[in-house]
C-alpha cells in the first residue's frame, strides 16, 4: 500500500522536511503533490510526468519544494504555515489513480529563556516570590530546576500559568538556592541562566561563647556573640543594662569580682528591621589557695610500709581530687581514700607506686592542681644478674664480669671467688685468665637503706676445650599446631660455633625452624607430630668439637578423627557385633561409645553378642586427649536384618 513518511515529523522553522514515499506502484504515468488531506487543484504544489520527466508547479508551489523521480517531496526553509497534511496523487499507466496522505508539524526554534522575579529580596516567613520564565512561547513546555535538581514536592511551591510561573510562598532561608527555568518543544530545549534567591532573615537569638559563666579573678574575659542573619547582624553589648560597645566581641582584661553581672548581646538586622538579645550571667570568683601534698613517710620500704598522702589546706565544703601518673585514680585494693577524699593511703607500697601524685581542690569554676609529688620507694636489691652470661672462657683472655641488681638506693656490690672476698665494686676484672681462675663467682648486692642483701653465684670454667654440650628446652611436651619449642645448646661460651642436627641430618630449610642467639637457640614454631625427632647440638671452638646427647621431642597431638573397624554397616541377626575404634593421638586417647546417643562403655572395643534388629542405630565413638584438651568423634550406622532376608550381609563373627 502506498504510504507517506515525514522525515522528521516534528520540523524546526528554517529547517527542511522530506516526504518519503513507500511502496510506489510500477508502471506509472505521473504523480502530483497537494497541500491538505485531499486532491484539490487549487492546492496543487507540483506535478510530475514520468515519460517527459517534466515537473510542473501548481498554485500552492512556493519555490521551496523539490520533487524527486521516486515521488518523494523535499520542502526547504520550513515556515510555521507549512504545518499540516500533504497528499500524493499517483496516476498509473492504466490510468487508475492512487492516493496517500502524510503530515508533519512545524515548531519554532526556542530562544534562551530568562527568569523575572517579582521580589529580589524577600523576607523570611513573610514574603512570597513569583518567578516567571520569559518569553511566553506557544506549544512550549516549561520546567524548573532548583540547585540543578528537579523541583522538590512542597506545599510552599506552586506552579501556574502552564508551569511558566513558579511561586514560593512564605520563603525561608533554606530557599536560598540557584533557580533555573527550561523551555522545551519537540524540536528544541533551552535552559536559562541561574537566578540566586537572596532571602533576608534573622537575626536569630544570638549565642554567646564561650559557654562557661564562672571566671577566676585576674583572668581575661573574652566574649563573642553570633546570630544567624542575612545581611550579617550588627552587634551591641550591654553590662547590667548599660551600653558598652558596638562590636561582635567584648574583651575585658584582668577581671575582678566587680565584673560579675549580666552581659547582654543585641543583634540587629537593618534590612529586616528585627532585633534579638541573649543574656548570660558572669560570676567572677576570688583566687582559692593552691593546694599542696604532705606525706607521712617520705622513704617507704617496698612491701613493708604504707604511705598516707594528704591534700592541704583543709577547706570546708570543698571537693578534693587525686591523680596518679596524670590519670584519675585506678581501682585497686591497695589505694584507699578517706571519707572527705582529702587523704590517699597506699597500703604496702611497691616500686611502681612512685607516682607522680597530684591533688586538686575543686571550686565552682575550676580545679586547682597541686605540684606533683614523687614517692621515693626503697626496694631491693633483687637477685643480681651477672653479665655476660658465658660460663666458659678460654685461657689468656680477660674476664670482665658486671653485676646489676634493681635497687633503690642503688646497691653496693661485692665479689667473692670460691667464697673469698675479692673487691667491693660492681665490675670484676681479671686479665689474662688461666684454668686456675675457674671457680664459683659470687656477686653480693646490698641495700644500705633497707638492710637487705641478695647474692647470685655463677660457675666460671676457664678451659680452651669445651665440655660435652647439653640441650635445654622451654617446653617438654608441646601441643601440635599450637606450641613453639625453643631448644638451647648449653653452655654459653665465647668464640664458639653452635651447630644443630635433626635425626643425624643437618637442619632442613623450613619457615618453622629459626636459629637465633648466635645459632645457640633453635626454635620450632607451630610444632607438628613430624617434629618428634632426635635433636642434637654441637659446639666447636679452636680446639674442640663436641656433640650433645640426642633430645627427642615428645609432641602431643590428636586425637584425629577416629576410624571404626570393621567397615561393615550391615549385619545378620544373631551375629556378634565387635567394633574397634582407633584414633591417632599422643598420648593415647580415652575412648567411649554411645548407641543412639546413650552412653555405653569407656573402652576401645565395643562388643555385643547375638545382635537383633533392636540393635539397629547410630554407633558413635568418642575420643579425648586429656593432654591436648582436644576431642573428636565419628558416627557409624548399623543395620541388623532378620536372618536370611538380605543376601550379602556380614556374618559379623
Amino acid at each position: 500500500k502506498l504510504t507517506i513518511e515525514s522525515t522528521p515529523f516534528n520540523v524546526a522553522e528554517g529547517k527542511e522536511v522530506l516526504l518519503l514515499v513507500h511502496n510506489l506502484p510500477q508502471h506509472l504515468f505521473g504523480y502530483s503533490w497537494y497541500k491538505g488531506e485531499r486532491v484539490d487543484g487549487n492546492r496543487q504544489i507540483i506535478g510530475y510526468v514520468i515519460g517527459t520527466q517534466q515537473a510542473t508547479p501548481g498554485p500552492a508551489y512556493s519555490g521551496r519544494e523539490i520533487i524527486y523521480p521516486n515521488a518523494s517531496l523535499l520542502i526547504q526553509n520550513i515556515i510555521q504555515n507549512d504545518t499540516g497534511f500533504y497528499t500524493l496523487h499517483v496516476i498509473k499507466s492504466d490510468l487508475v489513480n492512487e492516493e496517500a496522505t502524510g503530515q508533519f508539524r512545524v515548531y519554532p526554534e526556542l530562544p534562551k529563556p530568562s527568569i523575572s522575579s517579582n521580589n529580589s529580596k524577600p523576607v523570611e516567613d513573610k514574603d512570597a516570590v513569583a518567578f516567571t520564565c520569559e518569553p511566553e512561547t506557544q506549544d512550549a513546555t516549561y520546567l524548573w530546576w532548583v540547585n540543578n535538581q528537579s523541583l522538590p514536592v512542597s506545599p510552599r511551591l506552586q506552579l501556574s500559568n502552564g508551569n511558566r510561573t513558579l511561586t514560593l510562598f512564605n520563603v525561608t532561608r533554606n530557599d536560598t538556592a540557584s533557580y533555573k527555568c527550561e523551555t522545551q518543544n519537540p524540536v528544541s530545549a533551552r535552559r536559562s541562566d541561574s537566578v540566586i534567591l537572596n532571602v533576608l532573615y534573622g537575626p536569630d537569638a544570638p549565642t554567646i561563647s564561650p559557654l562557661n559563666t564562672s571566671y577566676r579573678s585576674g583572668e581575661n574575659l573574652n566574649l563573642s556573640c553570633h546570630a544567624a542573619s542575612n545581611p550579617p547582624a550588627q552587634y551591641s553589648w550591654f553590662v547590667n543594662g548599660t551600653f558598652q560597645q558596638s562590636t561582635q566581641e567584648l574583651f575585658i582584661p584582668n577581671i575582678t569580682v566587680n565584673n560579675s553581672g549580666s552581659y547582654t548581646c543585641q543583634a540587629h538586622n537593618s534590612d529586616t528591621g528585627l532585633n534579638r538579645t541573649t543574656v548570660t550571667t558572669i560570676t567572677v570568683y576570688a583566687e582559692p589557695p593552691k593546694p599542696f601534698i604532705t606525706s607521712n613517710n617520705s622513704n617507704p620500704v617496698e612491701d613493708e610500709d604504707a604511705v598516707a598522702l594528704t591534700c592541704e589546706p583543709e577547706i570546708q565544703n570543698t571537693t578534693y581530687l587525686w591523680w596518679v601518673n596524670n590519670q584519675s585514680l585506678p581501682v585497686s585494693p591497695r589505694l584507699q581514700l578517706s571519707n572527705d577524699n582529702r587523704t590517699l593511703t597506699l597500703l604496702s607500697v611497691t616500686r611502681n607506686d612512685v607516682g607522680p601524685y597530684e591533688c586538686g581542690i575543686q571550686n565552682e569554676l575550676s580545679v586547682d592542681h597541686s605540684d606533683p609529688v614523687i614517692l621515693n620507694v626503697l626496694y631491693g636489691p633483687d637477685d643480681p644478674t651477672i653479665s655476660p652470661s658465658y660460663t666458659y672462657y678460654r685461657p689468656g683472655v680477660n674476664l670482665s664480669l658486671s653485676c646489676h641488681a634493681a635497687s633503690n638506693p642503688p646497691a653496693q656490690y661485692s665479689w667473692l671467688i670460691d667464697g673469698n672476698i675479692q673487691q667491693h665494686t660492681q665490675e670484676l676484672f681479671i686479665s689474662n685468665i688461666t684454668e686456675k681462675n675457674s671457680g664459683l663467682y659470687t656477686c653480693q648486692a646490698n641495700n644500705s637503706a633497707s638492710g637487705h642483701s641478695r647474692t647470685t653465684v655463677k660457675t666460671i670454667t676457664v678451659s680452651a676445650e669445651l665440655p660435652k654440650p647439653s640441650i635445654s628446652s622451654n617446653n617438654s611436651k608441646p601441643v601440635e599446631d599450637k606450641d613453639a619449642v625453643a631448644f638451647t645448646c648449653e653452655p654459653e661460651a665465647q668464640n664458639t660455633t653452635y651447630l644443630w642436627w635433626v635425626n643425624g641430618q643437618s637442619l632442613p630449610v623450613s619457615p618453622r625452624l629459626q636459629l637465633s642467639n648466635g645459632n645457640r637457640t633453635l626454635t620450632l614454631f607451630n610444632v607438628t607430630r613430624n617434629d618428634a625427632r632426635a635433636y642434637v647440638c654441637g659446639i666447636q671452638n679452636s680446639v674442640s668439637a663436641n656433640r650433645s646427647d640426642p633430645v627427642t621431642l615428645d609432641v602431643l597431638y590428636g586425637p584425629d578423627t577416629p576410624i571404626i573397624s570393621p567397615p561393615d554397616s550391615s549385619y545378620l541377626s544373631g551375629a556378634n557385633l565387635n567394633l574397634s575404634c582407633h584414633s591417632a593421638s599422643n598420648p593415647s586417647p580415652q575412648y567411649s561409645w554411645r548407641i543412639n546417643g546413650i552412653p555405653q562403655q569407656h573402652t576401645q572395643v565395643l562388643f555385643i553378642a547375638k545382635i537383633t534388629p533392636n540393635n539397629n542405630g547410630t554407633y558413635a565413638c568418642f575420643v579425648s586427649n586429656l593432654a591436648t584438651g582436644r576431642n573428636n568423634s565419628i558416627v557409624k550406622s548399623i543395620t541388623v536384618s532378620a536372618s536370611g532376608t538380605s543376601p550379602g550381609l556380614s556374618a559379623g563373627a
Epitope: 685461657p395 689468656g396 684454668e435 676445650e465 642436627w501 641430618q505 666447636q540 671452638n541 679452636s542 680446639v543
Partner: antibody, heavy 120, light 106 residues
Framework: EVQLQQSGPGLVRPSQTLSLTCTAS????????MHWVRQPPGRGLEWIGW????????EYAPKFRGRVTMLADTSKNQFSLRLSSVTAADTAVYYC?????????????WGQGTLVTVSS | DIQMTQSPSSLSASVGDRVTITCSAS?????MHWYQQKPGKAPKLWIY???NLASGVPSRFSGSGSGTDYTFTISSLQPEDIATYYC?????????FGQGTKLEIK
C-alpha cells in the same frame, strides 16, 4: 673430600725465616681454626699455634711467641706459617691440622707433613 | 704449661694381649685425647674427649679417666695396632702432648 696440601722449602739456612703454606680443599677455612704442629726427628709432637682465618685472631705457644707469624688468605683458602731466626733446633716435620665437623661427625685432618731441615 | 707424662715410653706385647697406656697431667684437664701415628705418616685422632672413638676406630680400643689421670686400653692387641700413641690435653694453652708410647709386637 677434605684435604690439606702443604708446600714450602725443605731446606732453610740458620737465622733465615722458615715459610710454609697449607692449601685447604673440601671445606672453607674461614669457618674453622687452623693449627700448626711440628715433630722433631725421632721425638714427640709439639703444638705451635692456631689462626682464625675469619678475623686473623691467633694463639701461639709461648715457646714460639716473638718469632712466629700465622697468616690466612681466605680468597685462596690457604694459610701459612712463618718462623723467623731459625736454628738447627727447628729442624722438624711441620704439619698443618684442622678439627672440623664433617656432617654429623667431628673429624681431625692433617697435612702430609713437610720435613724442614735447618742447615748451612 | 701443663706437663703430660705418658707411661710406658715403649712396650712390647703379643697379639691378643690387653695393653694399657697411662697419661698423667700436671694439672686437672677437662678431657684427654689420644692420637695414633705410624712411621712416616701424620698423626690420626684415635680417641677424643677421653672415651669417644674416632670414626673408623675398632671397638677394641677404649679410653677412660678424669682430672689428671687417664688410661688408653687395647683389649686384644692386633698386628695393625703397632704404632706410637700420644695423649694430648686441650684444656689450656699451650696445647701439650705426651712424649709418646711406642707399641711393638713380641
Amino acid at each position: 673430600e677434605v684435604q690439606l696440601q702443604q708446600s714450602g722449602p725443605g731446606l732453610v739456612r740458620p737465622s733465615q725465616t722458615l715459610s710454609l703454606t697449607c692449601t685447604a680443599s673440601g671445606f672453607n677455612i674461614k669457618d674453622n681454626y687452623m693449627h700448626w704442629v711440628r715433630q722433631p726427628p725421632g721425638r714427640g709432637l709439639e703444638w705451635i699455634g692456631w689462626i682464625d682465618p675469619e678475623n686473623g685472631d691467633t694463639e701461639y705457644a709461648p715457646k714460639f711467641r716473638g718469632r712466629v707469624t700465622m697468616l690466612a688468605d681466605t680468597s685462596k683458602n690457604q694459610f701459612s706459617l712463618r718462623l723467623s731466626s731459625v736454628t738447627a733446633a727447628d729442624t722438624a716435620v711441620y704439619y698443618c691440622h684442622v678439627l672440623i665437623y664433617a656432617g654429623y661427625l667431628a673429624m681431625d685432618y692433617w697435612g702430609q707433613g713437610t720435613l724442614v731441615t735447618v742447615s748451612s | 704449661d701443663i706437663q703430660m707424662t705418658q707411661s710406658p715410653s715403649s712396650l712390647s706385647a703379643s697379639v691378643g694381649d690387653r695393653v694399657t697406656i697411662t697419661c698423667s697431667a700436671s694439672s686437672s684437664v677437662t678431657y684427654m685425647h689420644w692420637y695414633q701415628q705410624k712411621p712416616g705418616k701424620a698423626p690420626k685422632l684415635w680417641i677424643y674427649s677421653t672415651s669417644n672413638l674416632a670414626s673408623g676406630v675398632p671397638s677394641r680400643f677404649s679410653g677412660s679417666g678424669s682430672g689428671t689421670d687417664y688410661t688408653f686400653t687395647i683389649s686384644s692387641l692386633q698386628p695393625e695396632d703397632i704404632a706410637t700413641y700420644y695423649c694430648q690435653q686441650r684444656s689450656t694453652y699451650p696445647l701439650t702432648f705426651g712424649q709418646g708410647t711406642k707399641l711393638e709386637i713380641k
